[in-house]
């Protein structure tokens, strides 16, 4: 039993490097120590992420990929370990780091928020739906007036640079719009967003943020809402939102507003139709919104309301399409 052998020495890995391989993504790589005796034994490695956020894990491989913001730098350590049923032997640590990029903290963007929407694909024969991305941010409080910001996103192995910006009064980019992206809003991979900047007066500190596509996906409003009045009943029907998710993946909320007395009736539904009793002297406003439900993914936020449809009073039988 090697672990009980007093003279058995575990040597640390060698050639430990940390390399940025993409936006908010690093590759840690090391080699087994060439001087390690008994190299046929089952050696493992204990990796410790020291910054920007502490984490640790064991691996049998000699490399490890980490997805994490890099604007504050990145530091990690690794050591060789040998496990048995009752004890673990460990070598000393070796460490490496990526320095934080230059720039004072107050120059980087703040309050970065991003949302995605499903849109019709430009290549419908390949896949019918794609995802649009909109991000907004605030200019850093210490950023010079001539600062210009540039946004990039990475999803999986694909990276794109923003081409369509909104600007503030000083012509600085403060929002970005991608009409179509490579993002899969059904996936579990994280979306990495990186904003760097330039100025003649100061070094602008970059900023990275990771988003869960599920968390930032904004469900479109239900389509083709139709309303019909027939003998004091309101027949309301709609189609699922524009989405890659099928019909059964949606829950709905229906809002019927009586404009005469101000009463609001709200219904949570799993069906795409509803019948409601009404009086014949009021006008009603009808809106529907959708959310992706639990059979298909973690329940998401409610999407946007459909445009209101007004029925009632003189409009005895009306069908409107939106």
């Amino acid at each position: 039993d090697l672990l009980n052998h007093k003279k058995f020495l575990l040597l640390p890995p060698v050639n430990f490097t940390i390399k940025a391989t993409g936006l908010a993504q690093v590759l840690l790589h090391w080699d087994p120590n060439p001087d390690q005796e008994q190299r046929h034994v089952d050696l493992e490695y204990h990796v410790k992420i020291n910054a920007p956020q502490e984490d640790e894990y064991d691996t049998r491989k000699t490399e490890s990929k980490c997805v994490t913001p890099l604007h504050e730098g990145f530091a990690a350590s690794v050591r060789t370990i040998l496990k048995s049923s009752h004890t673990t032997l460990a070598s000393s640590w070796v460490s490496a780091e990526l320095k934080a990029p230059p720039g004072s903290p107050g120059t980087s963007v703040t309050n970065l928020t991003c949302t995605t929407h499903t849109v019709v694909s430009s290549h419908t024969h390949l896949r019918p739906y794609q995802v649009s991305l909109r991000c907004t941010w605030l200019v850093g409080k210490d950023a010079p007036e001539d600062t210009q910001y540039f946004l990039y996103y990475r999803f999986g192995v694909l990276t794109e640079k923003c081409q369509e910006y909104s600007r503030d009064a000083l012509n600085r980019n403060t929002a970005c719009w991608f009409p179509r992206t490579f993002i899969n809003s059904k996936g579990f991979e994280q979306l990495a967003v990186h904003i760097n900047g330039s100025s003649k007066r100061a070094a602008i500190k970059p900023f990275d943020q990771l988003f869960s596509p599920l968390a930032i996906d904004q469900v479109n409003p239900p389509r083709n809402v139709t309303v019909e009045i027939e003998s004091n009943s309101l027949y309301i029907q709609w189609e699922k939102p524009l989405s890659a998710f099928p019909d059964h993946c949606f829950n709905y909320e229906l809002k019927i507003y009586n404009t005469k007395n101000g009463h609001i009736q709200k219904e949570k539904l799993i069906a795409n139709k509803f019948i409601s009793k009404i009086d014949d002297v009021s006008t009603y406003s009808i809106q529907v919104r959708a959310a992706v439900s639990s059979p298909c993914r973690m329940p998401g936020r409610w999407g946007e309301w459909s445009q209101p449809i007004y029925v009632g009073k003189e409009r005895k039988s009306l069908v409107e399409w939106h």
């Epitope: 099928p246 019909d247 799993i270 795409n272 139709k273 059979p295």
Partner: antibody, heavy 124, light 107 residues
Framework: EVQLQQSGAELGKPGTSVKLSCKVS????????IHWVNQRPGKGLEWIGR????????IYAEKFKNKATLTADTSSNTAYMQLSQLKSDDTAIYFC?????????????????WGQGASVTVSS | DIQMTQSPASLSASLGETVTIECRTS??????LAWYQQKPGKSPQLLIY???SLHTGVPSRFSGSGSGTQYSLKINSLQSEDVASYSC?????????FGSGTKLEIK
């Protein structure tokens, strides 16, 4: 209680048509979909199509597009299926089915209430 | 159309045993799967919807599981009244499609 009452057994000659009915009591069919399913002797279930009684829009499985015609009459709360150009392999039991609306539970795509089935025999 | 591959076609088990029926789909159906029980000469009855939700009034010895393209129905502690045919059905995409059915018998 929701009930789906189907018309009786039909005996049809090859090339002719039959029309089956499904009367729903205890639920307004405008608030659901009516599905039709068949089962040939000794075989499994087969989805024929569904109709949305609120607007009369049907959806058919490809193989039944020129075979079945789905309609609904909301005033009598009844759905119908006409089978045309009958052949011997149309011999089967035909079920109507629907979902009873709930605010939770299965959506209108799941069949949780069924008719008793109507036997159609095609023979010369 | 989404193809449904149900197995086994038939199975025989003893009272009190646990049995499992599998259903594989040709593409991801996002848990849009129902299981039905049909006793001889009767109409089908809904057991499970959304792959794993037990329909009202169905005994808890029935359970559904799975995701993506692989789903299963499990019957714990088999009873004599469970003799029937069992079918899976996907409602993720039109046209809806059924599995070929599994005939369950008691040994």
């Amino acid at each position: 209680e929701v009930q789906l009452q189907q018309s009786g057994a039909e005996l049809g000659k090859p090339g002719t048509s039959v029309k089956l009915s499904c009367k729903v009591s205890g639920y307004n069919i405008k608030n659901t979909y009516i599905h039709w399913v068949n089962q040939r002797p000794g075989k499994g279930l087969e989805w024929i199509g569904r109709i949305d009684p609120a607007n009369g829009n049907p959806i058919y499985a490809e193989k039944f597009k020129n075979k079945a015609t789905l309609t609904a009459d909301t005033s009598s709360n009844t759905a119908y299926m006409q089978l045309s150009q009958l052949k011997s392999d149309d011999t089967a039991i035909y079920f109507c089915a629907m979902h009873r609306g709930h605010s939770m539970g299965p959506g209108p795509y799941v069949m949780d209430a069924w008719g008793q089935g109507a036997s159609v025999t095609v023979s010369s | 159309d989404i193809q449904m591959t149900q197995s086994p076609a038939s199975l025989s088990a003893s009272l009190g045993e646990t049995v499992t029926i599998e259903c594989r789909t040709s593409e991801d159906i996002y848990n849009g799967l129902a299981w039905y029980q049909q006793k001889p000469g009767k109409s089908p009855q809904l057991l499970i919807y959304n792959a794993n939700s037990l329909h009202t009034g169905v005994p808890s010895r029935f359970s559904g599981s799975g995701s993506g393209t692989q789903y299963s129905l499990k019957i714990n502690s088999l009873q004599s009244e469970d003799v029937a045919s069992y079918s899976c059905q996907q409602y993720s995409n039109y046209p809806f499609t059924f599995g070929s059915g599994t005939k369950l018998e008691i040994k």
